[in-house]
């Protein structure tokens, strides 16, 4: 008789999850010499230990502490790029501008990017059928708690000028409920961070509006200013040209506004 299994509203654990995490860790530590000392088996043991045999709606940041500790790395604190609802462009940018880092350019972010995982209470099984959805089931699920934890630590580490890429095509360019709005903004350290510079990415070809005047951007400015951090904002009218100019800054067309 098959054992009753909780049905959650979200997709199940990504297939071959353990193998994927281990393989990503090995690849990352090979590419990044400063992380060669990391024992990927220990990293996987810590990752697994955070959610296996635990109720997937009862995960805490403390569950991830061993993983956070083992995966800690040196990222230049003044080269951090945050993003909200525009992951692909942010990643394309850091692939070109190699001295800047998104969370997914760090070991822990790289391990978990685009993956889903959860376990079941009191069994050592990984649930490949379904996992809790943040809205429909519970917020303290393994994936959400992981991203909240790593995002908080990433923001805490930032210093000097921190950049954030925002999606100008969305109704809420700055969304208080996003990871950026609910976690990262509130964990920037005013004693270390001088300025948050927002890059608002335009979607439409002919869109020449100043999206830095958007009410949600003004709301972001207000939150940041209240935290004694300066705020600045730039429109990126042509993201394609923006990336091209990052690749080839000497190009004559790159002196004009992008």
């Amino acid at each position: 008789v098959p054992r009753w299994r909780q049905q959650w509203s979200g997709p199940g654990t990504t297939k071959r999850f353990p193998e994927t995490v281990l393989a990503r860790c090995v690849k990352y530590t090979e590419i990044h010499p400063e992380m060669r000392h990391v024992d990927c088996q220990s990293v996987w043991d810590a990752f697994k230990g955070a959610f296996i045999s635990k109720h997937p709606c009862n995960i805490t940041e403390e569950d991830y502490q061993p993983l956070m500790k083992l995966g800690t790395q040196t990222v230049p604190c003044n080269k951090i790029l945050l993003w909200s609802r525009i992951k692909d462009l942010a990643h394309q940018f850091t692939q070109v501008q190699r001295d800047m880092f998104t969370l997914e350019d760090t070991l822990l972010g790289y391990l978990a990017d685009d993956l889903t995982w959860c376990g079941e209470f009191n069994t050592s099984k990984i649930n490949y059928q379904s996992c809790p959805d943040w809205r429909k089931d519970c917020s303290n699920n393994p994936v959400s708690v992981f991203w909240k934890t790593v995002s908080r630590r990433f923001a805490e580490a930032a210093c000097d000028v921190v950049h954030v890429m925002l999606n100008g095509s969305r109704s809420k360019i700055f969304d208080k409920n996003s990871t950026f709005g609910s976690v990262e903004v509130h964990n920037l350290q005013p004693e270390k961070v001088q300025t948050l510079e927002a890059w608002v990415i335009h979607g439409g070809r002919e869109d020449s509006r100043d999206l830095c005047q958007d009410p949600t951007i003004k709301e972001l400015e207000s939150i940041i200013s209240k935290r004694n951090i300066q705020f600045s904002c730039k429109n990126i009218y042509r993201p394609d040209k923006f990336l091209q100019c990052v690749k080839n800054p000497e190009d004559s067309s790159c002196t004009s506004e992008i």
């Epitope: 220990s42 043991d45 230990g49 502490q65 061993p66 580490a157």
Partner: antibody, heavy 117, light 107 residues
Framework: QVQLVQSGAEVKKPGSSVKVSCKAS????????IEWVRQAPGQGLEWMGD????????DYNEKFKGRVTITADESTSTAYMELSSLRSEDTAVYYC??????????WGQGTLVTVSS | DIQMTQSPSSLSASVGDRVTITCRAS??????LGWYQQKPGKAPKLLIY???NLHTGVPSRFSGSGSGTDFTLTISSLQPEDFATYYC?????????FGQGTKVEIK
């Protein structure tokens, strides 16, 4: 080989502060946590806090929060532990150690701090 | 805080004896347990990390086992230099905590 060399013994008055140093060599200082542990005379081991020198991450034992500050100087591969508002119960040997797989693989020789009026 | 309880707190044994020290955590610590040896006036030395991994340079007569809440350090054949105090330590959650120690004395 990995070595952690600590500063010398200190005698301090109650209410004052002490700063113990821990100079690391034989490995990449910025890649490993440095842990601080103390041991009162005839007693067991007590974890105080740690630092990841490459990112400045620190974690402290709540018991010492507000009294202990752990810092690191990358240029000299040296970690520091400062304990303030000293009292007689703080008389102990203070150790630094390198973190490895959530344990501590190499230890300094220890620094005796005596708090006495 | 996670409490670490070692037993026994002291034991007397002879050279060549097999010695077992246990450590119990007040909650699940997975495999994040270290074992240390300390001699009077000296800094502790790591013997075992991650419950069962022998640290570099540690003699193979030392071994560790366990996961979850119950752990064991075994010395297969006690040598004169093994008379010391042994501590376990959990690394699962802050604050890291140590057992109270087990003193191994000569019978």
């Amino acid at each position: 080989q990995v070595q952690l060399v600590q500063s010398g013994a200190e005698v301090k008055k109650p209410g004052s502060s002490v700063k113990v140093s821990c100079k690391a060599s034989g490995y990449t200082f910025t890649n490993h946590w440095i842990e601080w542990v103390r041991q009162a005379p005839g007693q067991g081991l007590e974890w105080m806090g740690d630092i990841f020198p490459g990112g400045g991450y620190t974690d402290y034992n709540e018991k010492f929060k507000g009294r202990v500050t752990i810092t690191a100087d990358e240029s000299t591969s040296t970690a520091y532990m400062e304990l303030s508002s000293l009292r007689s119960e703080d008389t102990a040997v203070y150790y630094c150690a390198r973190g490895r797989d959530l344990a501590m693989d190499y230890w300094g020789q220890g620094t005796l701090v005596t708090v006495s009026s | 805080d996670i409490q670490m309880t070692q037993s026994p707190s002291s034991l007397s044994a002879s050279v060549g004896d097999r010695v077992t020290i246990t450590c119990r955590a007040s909650q699940n610590i997975n495999v994040w347990l270290g074992w240390y040896q300390q001699k009077p006036g000296k800094a502790p030395k790591l013997l075992i990390y991650k419950a069962s991994n022998l640290h570099t340079g540690v003699p193979s007569r030392f071994s560790g086992s366990g996961s979850g809440t119950d752990f064991t350090l075994t010395i297969s054949s006690l040598q004169p230099e093994d008379f010391a105090t042994y501590y376990c330590q959990q690394g699962q959650s802050y604050p890291y905590t140590f057992g109270q120690g087990t003193k191994v004395e000569i019978k």
